[in-house]
């Protein structure tokens, strides 16, 4: 995945008080056991600041040594730092954990922008809100990185949540996750839950405060309003998705669906914006300009580079239109549509004008490597990684940030036809899907 | 070719509010795609950022003085006028009517600007 | 807020000289940086833009470099009318709001 423009990632914290929750729709999927109701000790788990990262505390090594892990649906190796580095407050020592064993192999893993390299090895892990159990898992000890680390982001290292085909050196390596199932009864399912502040934080602000959940093993109803509509997984190695409609403002982008799904669509906690293939979003953001006309913005606000700003509380909301996405559904020729505001793709920025002002940055953004859904889908939504069934679900978010005009919404069923001519089969190629 | 001119009264008395008009000639502000904007200079000072405003009527103003400026736009007329209430000595300045050109990012035109002295 | 800081505040040069002046922002504004020009008695005039590109009738003498947050207006052969006050302008936040303190240069 592109390190440079993946990270650093956004988060924000609050978002809309409980008592703007929506009603909850009743046709509800039957309870499984062990998979659904309240998971109380994981709920509020993730913490971050603003475009560098949701992160979660594990612990590593015996006795346990307390890291800040960025979650990362788009990657699959559990990445730590392992030596000084002046961004990190703190790092992993391996020469101090009774239970580490050197696997004696490196892994040098390089982006667009910036590597990280180190040594592999297992210990091992448990995560303090999560599940209660420890697993042995594979570890990358970073011990040289390049633009990796974010300073004052808070996190030490990565948790990569994707398959095996990914992982680096190569698909051998087991993921944490696998591990954790493996190892454990902990059924083959997490659920993410980010939210979006809709205001910039200051660093003590992030600290005290709470960014969401990541329900390891389980989906916690608290966390979502209404129905949970599922997308098949297409591939294991990504979250790969399928991308059969866009709509602004209702408006049919009308373009060939295979174009939105060029080369992969993917669900990417990593990444902090909506990235869309070069041409959707050349398309899109032609729509979106013609549909927030009464105001002209700079090039370089539709390019992500300038921050536009207006006095605190005057966000003119209502001129920018909703983004609607229909997914590929679990029925033949059905499909369903998540929705999002510009509460979620204009992504507040701290420290760049007064306190007076309120101040933003264009988070959708072009890609040469697909769609990828960040965090400026994720935060509308509570997202269900069901592992097990091969599915991704998609619920409102009971904690996105919304007005009293309009909220996101996961609306079905829609009937689409031919839907499987939507995915684009790439050609096998021995290069590395970093690097692209 | 583009020009701006500014005019309103030369001397205002404390309290009350100062109102300036900028006439733009040799183009339509409701034909092109720039913001309009209100910079003012004191004596012997920097260049303060006022506000500007859209040919939709949407305005921008500087957080300083949002509480005391109103700015508008009369397409029919050409025109478009600054307001700034309660004034006191603190308010006397050159002020400037200019057009945010060149990407709407830079203040590429202005007009000559006119001297407002607040005095009783 | 974005602070842009102009130095020095006094340029005393002779004409013919290379006079090099300096703005500097608190956090970047990547290439969004202009540059103008201030004679006694008149309205700014706008030389550069983006950070190096000459406005419209600008004489090559004058050019602009640097991004991020270290700027640099360079007047290659100062001419006599060049003698006036420079000032700075960000429009990373937008719309364009902020300009630096100013700098004068003065003939020697």
């Known amino acids: 995945t592109q390190h440079g423009i993946r990270l650093p990632l956004r988060s924000g914290l609050g978002g809309a008080p409980l008592g703007l929750r929506l009603p909850r729709e009743t046709d509800e999927e039957p309870e499984e056991p062990g998979r659904r109701g309240s998971f109380v000790e994981m709920v509020d788990n993730l913490r971050g600041k603003s475009g560098q990262g949701y992160y979660v505390e594990m612990t590593v090594g015996s006795p346990p040594q307390t890291l800040n892990i960025l979650v990362d649906t788009g990657s699959s190796n559990f990445a730590v730092g392992a030596a000084p580095h002046p961004f990190l407050h703190r790092y992993y020592q391996r020469q101090l954990s009774s239970t580490y064993r050197d696997l004696r192999k490196g892994v040098y893993v390089p982006y667009t922008q910036g590597k990280w390299e180190g040594e592999l090895g297992t210990d091992l892990v448990s995560i303090p809100h999560g599940p209660n159990v420890t697993v042995r898992a594979n570890i990358a000890a970073i011990t040289e990185s390049d633009k990796f680390f974010i300073n004052g982001s808070n996190w030490e290292g990565i948790l990569g949540l994707a398959y095996a085909e990914i992982a680096r050196p190569d698909d051998s390596l087991e993921p944490f996750f696998d591990s954790l199932v493996k190892q454990t009864h902990v059924p083959n399912l997490f659920s993410l839950q980010l939210c979006g502040a809709g205001f910039p934080l200051n660093q003590s602000e992030v600290l005290a405060s709470v960014g969401g959940s990541m329900i390891i093993g389980g989906i916690d109803h608290s966390l979502y309003t209404g129905s949970l509509w599922y997308t098949p997984i297409r591939r294991e190695w990504y979250y790969e998705v399928i991308i059969v409609r866009v709509e602004i403002n209702g408006q049919d982008l009308k373009m060939d669906c295979k174009e939105y799904n060029y080369d992969k669509s993917i669900v990417d906690s990593g990444t902090t914006n909506l990235r869309l293939p070069k041409k959707v979003f050349e398309a899109a953001v032609k729509s979106i300009k013609a549909a927030s006309s009464t105001e002209k913005f700079p090039d370089g606000f539709w390019l992500g580079e300038q921050l536009v700003c207006w006095q605190a509380g005057t966000t003119p909301w209502n001129i920018f239109p909703v983004i609607s996405l229909y997914l590929m559904g679990e029925v033949t020729n059905q499909s369903f549509r998540i929705t999002i505001l510009p509460q979620q793709y204009l992504r507040p920025v701290e420290d760049v004008a007064t306190s007076q002002d309120d101040c933003y940055k264009f988070a959708i953004s072009q890609s040469s490597t697909g769609t990828v859904m960040g965090a400026v889908i994720m935060e509308g939504f509570y997202v269900v990684f069901d592992r097990a069934r091969k599915r991704i679900g998609f619920a409102v978010s009971a904690c996105h940030v919304h007005d009293e005009f309009r909220t996101a919404a996961v609306e079905g069923p829609f009937v689409t036809l031919d839907m499987e001519d939507c995915g684009y089969n790439i050609p096998q190629t021995d290069e590395s899907t970093l690097m692209t | 070719q583009l020009q701006l001119q500014e005019s309103g009264p030369g001397l205002v008395k404390p309290s009350e509010t100062l109102s300036l008009t900028c006439t733009v000639s040799?183009?339509?502000?409701?034909?092109?795609?720039?913001?309009w904007s209100w910079i003012r200079q004191p004596p012997g000072k920097g260049l303060e950022w006022i506000g500007s405003?859209?040919?939709?009527?949407?305005?921008y103003y500087n957080p300083s003085l949002k509480s005391r400026v109103t700015i508008s736009v009369d397409t029919s007329k050409n025109q478009f006028s600054l307001k700034l209430s309660s004034v006191t000595a603190a308010d006397t300045a050159v002020y400037y009517c200019?057009?945010?050109?060149?990407?709407?990012?830079?203040?590429?035109?202005w007009g000559r600007g006119t001297l407002v002295t607040v005095s009783s | 807020e974005i602070v842009l800081t102009q130095s020095p505040a006094t340029l005393s040069l002779s004409p013919g000289e290379r006079a090099t002046l300096s703005c500097r922002a608190s956090?970047?504004?990547?290439?969004?940086l202009a540059w103008y020009q201030q004679k006694p008695g008149q309205a700014p005039r706008l030389l550069i833009y983006?950070?190096?590109n000459r406005a419209t009738g600008i004489p090559a003498r004058f050019s602009g470099s640097g991004s991020g947050t270290d700027f640099t207006l360079t007047i290659s052969s100062l001419e006599p009318e060049d003698f006036a006050v420079y000032y700075c302008?960000?429009?990373?936040?937008?719309?364009?709001?902020?300009f630096g303190g100013g700098t004068k240069v003065e003939i020697k």
């Open positions: 200019a057009r945010v050109g060149h990407g709407i990012n830079y203040f590429d035109l």
């Open positions: 983006d950070a190096s």
């Open positions: 405003i859209y040919r939709s009527g949407r305005t």
């Open positions: 040799g183009g339509s502000i409701s034909w092109s795609s720039y913001y």
């Open positions: 956090q970047s504004v990547s290439s969004y």
């Open positions: 302008q960000q429009s990373i936040t937008w719309p364009p709001r902020t």
